[in-house]
Interface confidence: low
């Protein structure tokens, strides 16, 4: 009822001391080679002169980090990246980075890469609001970081920030002009 030589599984390595004979009920645990991760049970058991169990090692490495337009990779380049390895990007001038500067190899897949955007980020005319208007003459194009202010028509009250700012090509949230409650 004893078991003889250990079974071999692709990319799996038996742990502990190797023996010629294993007693019934004895268990042997396997670990995976570099770049591989155990999928399911990691051990085999000797039952009636046969080994039961099938440790499976899955390739969790990544290749070819995502290409980011107008960016280059600044961390060391590898032909294969183990799960958990990070790759760092830098934007070419004059582009600005939005999102995480690093991607990570996560069980065979890369996390989302950043974007390198043109930092000009201009805005169009400010959004119109009900019962209110901007205090300056509206332009067709606004430079990044420029601000405009709103004012409400007579008898309406302003709720929120009266000033909005152009950031990354978008205006911040405009205020509302509410009709005051009349008692």
């Amino acid at each position: 009822t004893d078991c003889l030589s250990l079974p071999s599984f692709e990319n799996a390595i038996p742990m502990g001391e190797k023996k010629d004979v294993y007693k019934a009920g004895e268990q042997v645990t396997y670990t995976c080679a570099t770049y591989y991760k155990m999928d399911g049970a990691s051990n085999v058991t000797c039952i009636n002169s046969r080994w039961t169990g099938r440790p499976t090692c899955r390739d969790t490495s990544c290749v070819n980090p995502p290409t980011v337009q107008n960016a280059y990779i600044v961390s060391r380049q590898m032909s294969k990246y183990p799960s958990g390895e990070r790759v760092r990007y830098q934007c070419r001038s004059p582009y600005e980075m939005f999102g995480d500067e690093e991607v990570m190899c996560l069980n065979g897949n890369w996390t989302e890469p950043p974007q390198c955007k043109d930092s000009t980020g201009k805005c169009g005319p400010p959004p119109p609001i009900d019962n209110g208007d901007i205090t300056s003459f509206p332009l067709s194009v606004y430079a990044p970081a420029s601000s405009v202010e709103y004012q409400c028509q007579n008898l309406y009250q302003l709720e929120g920030n009266k000033r909005i700012t152009c950031r990354n090509g978008q205006w911040s949230e405009p205020p509302k002009c509410l009709h005051p409650c009349v008692i």
Epitope: E102, V103, M104, L106
Partner: antibody, heavy 112, light 106 residues
Framework: QVQLQQSGPGLVQPSQSLSITCTVS????????VHWIRQSPGKGLEWLGV???????DYNAAFISRLNINKDNSKSQVFFKMNSLQANDTAIYYC???????????WGQGTS | QIVLSQSPTFLSASPGEKVTVTCRAS?????MHWYQQKPGASPKPWIF???NLASGVPARFSGSGSGTSYSLTISRVEAEDAATYYC?????????FGNGTKLELK
């Protein structure tokens, strides 16, 4: 081990500002982004914004006009400031470390 | 913004039972994350990018899904699993969270 320690007032008057400092240890702000998330019984978990490792910030459009996030890498500190607070801003505010885009692994203890 | 609807809101299960929490998105998303939160504590990462268990999470947990429908499954629920579970999408800014599913053990 990785930690994010928050410090800031527990009580803010209406129309005043909330300022919270998040001091991190065991990792560098030059390598990891830090998110700000709040939690309230009425609205649940809400993502407010993030400051990335490179220093650029992304904000939730609903808060962009009254929220500012910046940091000092050398002091391992991230600074959060929200203006014009109202009663419906009552919540627990958390800073949390970025893990891949927009997911977080380690959280601060929260500021009520 | 993308709205995430979790169901059920409340779940009562006996130890050893199989439990599934569903998260539906108002538009298609690329991945879903899951967090566990216990009373008085900060949320903890539980499952990253749909199916990757965070460090220290027991193998009885699993995540799956695509498009607008995602789920978190516990194959045999244990007492320590009692908590609130939140899903989170990050395909479109702003990242949004589900309303939470509170799991109670009988």
């Amino acid at each position: 081990q990785v930690q994010l320690q928050q410090s800031g007032p527990g009580l803010v008057q209406p129309s005043q500002s909330l300022s919270i400092t998040c001091t991190v240890s065991d990792f560098s702000l030059a390598r990891y982004g830090v998110h700000w998330i709040r939690q309230s019984p009425g609205k649940g978990l809400e993502w407010l914004g993030v400051i990335w490792s490179g220093g650029t910030a992304d904000y939730n459009a609903a808060f962009i006009s009254r929220l500012n996030i910046n940091k000092d890498n050398s002091k391992s500190q991230v600074f959060f400031k929200m203006n014009s607070l109202q009663a419906n801003d009552t919540a627990i505010y958390y800073c949390a470390r970025n893990f891949g885009n927009y997911a977080v692994d380690y959280w601060g203890q929260g500021t009520s | 913004q993308i709205v995430l609807s979790q169901s059920p809101t409340f779940l009562s299960a006996s130890p050893g039972e199989k439990v599934t929490v569903t998260c539906r998105a108002s538009s298609s998303v690329k991945y879903m994350h899951w967090y566990q939160q216990k009373p008085g504590a900060s949320p903890k990462p539980w499952i990253f990018a749909t199916s990757n268990l965070a460090s220290g999470v027991p193998a009885r947990f699993s995540g799956s899904g695509s498009g607008t429908s995602y789920s978190l499954t516990i194959s045999r629920v244990e007492a320590e699993d009692a908590a609130t579970y939140y899903c989170q999408q990050w395909s479109i800014i702003p990242p949004t969270f589900g309303n939470g599913t509170k799991l109670e053990l009988k």
